[in-house]
Interface confidence: low
């Protein structure tokens, strides 16, 4: 199953205390897929897409970017024949960076 696309969604964080919004989108018409967001290989959040949408937006509260480190990836799962779950490939990584403080 092809990998989803992943991108940061405005408003972008300006510090580690700001929330992060990450959109994850399946490439085709996959209704109601289950999406998983990873950071540094660990599960951060799980969301299910509405049945008429092919993507979700993960909303991470401020401070959740601190640990574990590393880039974010997402993945989705869909039901195949006989209700067997099948997982997509992992998305490309997305890195969250913050402006360097001037003080």
């Amino acid at each position: 199953i092809p990998a989803p696309s992943i991108r940061l969604v405005p408003p972008y964080p300006s510090s580690q205390e700001d929330p992060i919004h990450i959109a994850c989108m399946a490439p085709g018409n996959f209704p109601g897929a289950n999406f998983t967001l990873y950071r540094g290989g660990q599960v951060v959040q799980l969301l299910q897409a509405p049945t008429d949408q092919r993507g979700v937006t993960f909303n991470l509260s401020g401070g959740s970017s601190k640990a574990p480190g590393g880039p974010f990836h997402c993945q989705y799962g869909v039901l195949g024949e006989l209700n067997q779950s099948q997982l997509s490939d992992l998305s490309e990584p997305v890195n969250v960076s913050f402006p360097v403080p001037t003080w």
């Epitope: 085709g28 018409n29 209704p31 049945t51 039901l79 024949e81």
Partner: antibody, heavy 124, light 107 residues
Amino acid sequence: QVQLVESGGGVVQPGRSLRVSCAVSGFTFSSYGMHWVRQAPGGGLEWVAVMSYEGSFRHYADSVKGRFTISRDNSKNTLFLQMDSLRAEDTAVYYCARDRPAGYTSGWGILDYWGQGTLVTVSS
Amino acid sequence: EIVMTQSPATLSLSPGERATLSCRASQSVSSYLAWYQQKPGQAPRLLIYDASNRATGIPARFSGSGSGTDFTLTISSLEPEDFAVYYCQQRSNWPLTFGGGTKVDIK
């Protein structure tokens, strides 16, 4: 061989209801998503609705949402389209069509077998 | 919704000639595009799915190409039975949408 046969079309007054059916044979109906697509006289094709193979997922075109209901009876190999609050612009040949993937994994929307259609005319 | 635009509306050709039909999407549909053939009084028939894959039983003279927003259906050498209306359809997102059709008729 794969066969899809629609029935139930006819002339109906605006505001009234009609249910069209699609009887299938030649494949395992309960393994396939199914669609309704319509074609106004002399016009192009318009997708109407889809239902997943086991019935948990349905989706509709905005033009029919809230008025039409897709359903299926896997024990009878039959797909249905209940059409309520019919309008003149619903006048069309209604086709049922099979979705090529047997499940969710390939996405929706490859319509590989179609019935011959049933004509629904909404007129006073 | 994604709007599919086909051109030309009518293509007048002779048997044996090459037919090139175009389909354009209002936004990218990746390769999630199908082509159907419809003859008068008949149901549509799937020809090509996912831009370039021939459906079961479709002759090799039919081929599809393209990705993103621009797609082409080519009939390398028209046979008498190929004169019909051809529709493109995207499945990248709901609702599924069809182009307005290209009629291939005999010159």
